[in-house]
């Protein structure tokens, strides 16, 4: 397993909708053909695995139909979109690449994109 | 190298409590998590739960219903995993582990194991 | 809590001969991970993150799967590979394993 750089931003503020988008860049030693991306949640002592998608460099990333996440690549950039957050989602959301082929196999992981989701205030009942 | 290394064979009253220690060595131990997992005879391996070192903070299966507590003594590297009002279906192996690297391959160092026996 | 389902519950194969494991989950995960435990002993990690063969294991295991149904599979059984093969989950807390697949050698 060989080591590989891999940048994301440091704090991200999701919409009142509850997305967050954020950009996964790595850098590529080689001319990987399969890649695959993770997205892992750490709060607290807990690290859960959000999502994950494998795809051949050109084409777009596949996530499984009931995952939260969504993303589309562009070279060594991965652009990956979270949706369906709520407050208690609020976490470090850890970008993890694989370069799956050809060998050799490189891991890279991200120091972690800080995600802030604020639950929007219920809109007051109006009376006309 | 990383080593995980458990206390010895308990055995215990029903109603008491036992505190099984884990000493770390081979790497920092405030990087890591540890879990705890155990096997009972004839059973499969169960996730207690676990504490991050560093922060101190804990995360329990609710299946053992508040019974179980984490703790951690950085000065020492050393873990160790409390369970309380033991009943006979408490005897178990019960084991300490951790991640292979940040964040992937998990649960790639194991402790020997503990052997826990519940009996009046 | 996500529930895993092993199948078959032990087999019993040759040495030489393939052997397959498969584990369900009761919703969908992004990884499954794989440990062998033989008695006496503590648990082996085998296969994490689906495929990914942990270090030291031989190329002979190989894991594979998405969603909730997954697959270890051994190219080619050995003496050695006798033991309860585990899978486990950690997409949500708490974490669960699998009800464990004997593997027995004829």
């Known amino acids: 397993c060989k080591a590989m750089h891999v940048a994301q931003p440091a704090v991200v503020l999701a919409s009142s909708r509850g997305i967050a988008s954020f950009v996964c860049e790595y850098a590529s030693p080689g001319k990987a053909t399969e890649v695959r991306v993770t997205v892992l949640r750490q709060a607290d002592s807990q690290v859960t695995e959000v999502c994950a998608a494998t795809y051949m460099m050109g084409n777009e990333l596949t996530f499984l139909d009931d995952s939260i996440c969504t993303g589309t690549s562009s070279g060594n950039q991965v652009n990956l979109t979270i949706q369906g957050l709520r407050a208690m989602d609020t976490g470090l959301y850890i970008c993890k690449v694989e370069l799956m082929y050809p060998p050799p196999y490189y891991l890279g992981i991200g120091n972690g994109t800080q995600i802030y989701v604020i639950d929007p205030e219920p809109c007051p009942d109006s009376d006309f | 190298e990383v080593q995980l290394v458990q206390s010895g064979a308990e055995v215990k009253k029903p109603g008491a409590s036992v505190k099984v220690s884990c000493k770390a060595s081979g790497y920092t131990f405030t990087d890591y998590n540890m879990d705890w997992v155990r096997q009972a005879p004839g059973a499969g391996l169960d996730w207690m739960g676990n504490?991050?070192?560093?922060?101190?903070?804990?995360s329990y299966n609710q299946k053992f219903k508040g019974r179980v507590t984490l703790t951690a003594d950085t000065s020492t590297s050393t873990a160790y995993m409390e369970l309380s009002s033991l009943r006979a279906g408490d005897i178990a192996v019960y084991y300490c582990?951790?991640?292979?690297?940040?964040?992937?391959?998990?649960?790639?160092?194991w402790g020997q194991g503990t052997l826990v026996t519940v009996s009046s | 809590d996500i529930v895993m389902t092993q199948t078959p519950l032990s087999l019993s194969v040759s040495p030489g001969e393939p052997a397959s494991i498969s584990c369900s989950a009761s919703?969908?995960?992004?990884?499954m991970h794989w440990f062998r435990h033989k008695p006496g002993q503590s648990p082996q990690s085998l296969i994490y993150s689906t495929s990914i063969l942990a270090s030291g294991v031989p190329d002979r295991f190989s894991g594979s799967g998405s969603g909730t149904d997954f697959t270890l599979k051994i190219s080619r059984v050995e003496a050695d590979d006798a033991g309860v093969y585990y899978c486990?989950?950690?997409?949500?807390?708490?974490?669960?394993f699998g009800t464990g697949t004997k593997l027995e050698l004829k």
């Open positions: 504490i991050n070192p560093n922060s101190e903070s804990t």
């Open positions: 582990t951790r991640d292979g690297n940040r964040y992937d391959a998990w649960f790639a160092y």
């Open positions: 919703s969908s995960v992004t990884y």
């Open positions: 486990q989950q950690r997409t949500s807390y708490p974490l669960t």
